[in-house]
């Protein structure tokens, strides 16, 4: 009689996470009598996966009935595979005794687990940045196996090239993580832009996962200011407007100064949105010129999104006017119809208002 051999026909088996893995093992003889055990790994630290003789192995079922007469098939099925199950599995024949002793081992079957990467999470800088600045975005995805993975960056569909990617750990592991940092140069038109991180992996069947970040969360477009003097609306009254153009985000506070003294402060509320996602706003000031002997320096001061204020000034020429009674102390008419703010429609105005 030829000596028993333990046959593990599959050198390797690959299984998707969540599925069952079938590990094949047959013996070539009924002799010697004794049980089969399955181990993951070899040597003293090997992990018992199944013991025909004794123990409770809730995830393991035998493919053949072990009580079947002349049974020589000791294949097992392991349910609900996770990346932690990866490794080399050995089918080992034991010889009956007190205790049973190891008789012969199979050559082993390497189980690899295909695990999908988690949805990529893209995060941008903590603070907003202005156009022409370079900002960094990170993309992370975890829990995938095998290690091979492809990551790409896009901005509005255009592939980016300035990025660095690491897959960890470097050595063998049950599952892996990817971390990538991309550098993006902001432009004034980026309010509606998106940065996309795309991850391709064998488990995704050609349908990559994407994570996105909206540059609206990252960009700050500072306003441009223009102060203009409108034609005289009524005798002794001048309408001065401050046009605040192309800003983002909307958070903006405007202060009028007359000769350096605060005249009025207001917060942008009803604004106009441009096609590029930036906003426009206009504020006006009615100045009663008869109240002034000298020229008036009008300043439109804007604090945008908590940044240091920017301002634009306009010198209002005051001609020699006869004094009118009752108005000698008034530099401004405070009637509600004569002060306030208005939408200013830019060339690329979307022609609708935003009420926040």
């Amino acid at each position: 009689e030829e000596e028993l051999q333990v046959i593990q026909p599959d050198k390797s088996v690959s299984v998707a996470a969540g599925e069952s893995a079938i590990l094949h093992c047959t013996v070539t003889s009924l002799i010697p009598v004794g049980p089969i055990q399955w181990f993951r790994g070899a040597g003293p630290a090997r992990e018992l996966i199944y013991n025909q003789k004794e123990g409770h192995f809730p995830r393991v079922t035998t493919v053949s009935e072990s009580t079947k007469r002349e049974n020589m098939d000791f294949s097992i099925s392991i349910s609900n595979i996770t990346p932690a199950d990866a490794g080399t599995y050995y089918c080992v024949k034991f010889r009956k005794g007190s205790p049973d002793t190891e008789f012969k081992s199979g050559a082993g079957t390497e189980l690899s687990v295909r695990a999908k990467p988690s949805a990529p999470v893209v995060s941008g800088p903590a603070a907003r940045a202005t156009p022409q600045h370079t900002v960094s975005f990170t993309c992370e995805s975890h829990g995938f196996s095998p290690r091979d993975i492809t990551l790409k960056w896009f901005k509005n569909g255009n592939e980016l090239s300035d990025f660095q990617t690491n897959v960890d750990p470097v050595g063998e592991s049950v599952s892996y993580s990817i971390h990538s940092t991309a550098k993006v140069v902001l432009t004034r038109e980026d309010v509606h832009s998106q940065v996309i991180c795309e991850v391709a992996h064998v488990t995704l069947q050609g349908d990559p996962l994407r994570g996105t970040a909206n540059l609206s969360e990252t960009i700050r477009v500072p306003p441009t200011l223009e102060v203009t003097q409108q034609p005289v609306r009524a005798e002794n009254q001048v309408n001065v407007t401050c046009q605040v153009r192309k800003f983002y985000p909307q958070r903006l506070q405007l202060t009028w100064l007359e000769n350096g003294n605060v005249s009025r402060t207001e917060t942008a509320s009803t604004v106009t949105e441009n096609k590029d996602g930036t906003y426009n706003w206009m504020s006006w000031l009615l100045v009663n010129v008869s109240a002034h002997r000298d020229d008036v320096k009008l300043t439109c001061q804007v604090e945008h999104d908590g940044q240091p204020a920017v301002s634009k000034s306009h010198d209002l020429k005051v001609s020699a006017h006869p004094k009118e009674q009752g108005s000698n102390t008034a530099a401004e008419n405070t009637g509600s119809n004569e002060r306030g703010s208005s939408d200013y429609k830019d060339d690329d105005d979307k022609h609708h208002h935003h009420h926040h």
């Epitope: 003789k53 004794e54 009956k96």
Partner: antibody, heavy 119, light 110 residues
């Protein structure tokens, strides 16, 4: 280590029934057949029947088909043999034995239960 | 059913000599290249103990002075050299079909 525990003795009246137990330990009960063997005093061994505890499949010696009924309780790892309509000819030692190689052999034996049928 | 006939029914062997017990089956007990014959030893007041399985394979813990041989229908258990502790009754059993036992052979040591 494998152990099969059987009560030492059972005294029963003629015509009655007796249910013999065999409690298994030291191995996975459902993975190996249990055999039952009869031995009358001073006589040889007679194979009665066998049961697969995993699914209660049974094989009987035709001679004992109407005499013995095998069952198992997987929750307590115990095999049972009920003997019915007892007569003096049923007085014997009854062994349970475990088949460790699925060869329909008897690798490990209990110590046996001595059944005496007497009025 | 396959009937197993053991012979002799009893024998006495001197210490250190060879004991030979025969078991003949009414038809072949071979299947798939294996001979489904098993040998047991039983001492008084004890359950039987498996000695040899599949005709010629020594069970664990059984001394090498026990050996089995044969195929088809004719099988032999040999004990050599016999020791005092070998005094017992020996049974053959087949499992080619449902199991049956031979009638037993009682071995005495002289």
């Amino acid at each position: 280590q494998v152990q099969l525990q059987q009560p030492g003795t059972e005294l029963v009246r003629p015509g009655a029934s007796v249910k013999l137990s065999c409690k298994a330990s030291g191995y996975t009960f459902t993975n190996y057949w249990i055999n039952w063997v009869k031995q009358r005093p001073g006589q040889g061994l007679e194979w009665i029947a066998m049961i697969d505890p995993s699914d209660s499949e049974t094989h009987y010696n035709q001679i004992f088909k109407d005499k013995a009924t095998l069952t198992v309780d997987k929750s307590s790892n115990t095999a049972y043999m009920q003997l019915s309509s007892l007569t003096s000819g049923d007085s014997a030692v009854y062994y349970c034995a475990m088949d460790y190689g699925s060869l329909y052999a008897m690798d490990y034996w209990g110590r046996g239960t001595s059944v005496t049928v007497s009025s | 059913d396959i009937v197993l006939t053991q012979s002799p029914a009893s024998l006495a062997v001197s210490l250190g000599q060879r004991a030979t017990i025969s078991c003949r089956a009414s038809k072949s007990v071979s299947s798939s290249g294996y001979n489904y014959i098993f040998w047991y030893q039983q001492k008084p007041g004890q359950p039987p103990k498996l000695l040899i399985y599949l005709a010629s394979n020594l069970d664990s813990g059984v001394p090498a002075r026990f050996s089995g041989s044969g195929s088809g229908t004719d099988f032999t258990l040999n004990i050599h050299p016999v020791e005092e502790e070998d005094a017992a009754t020996y049974y053959c059993q087949h499992s080619r079909e449902l199991p049956t036992f031979g009638g037993g052979t009682k071995l005495e040591i002289k």
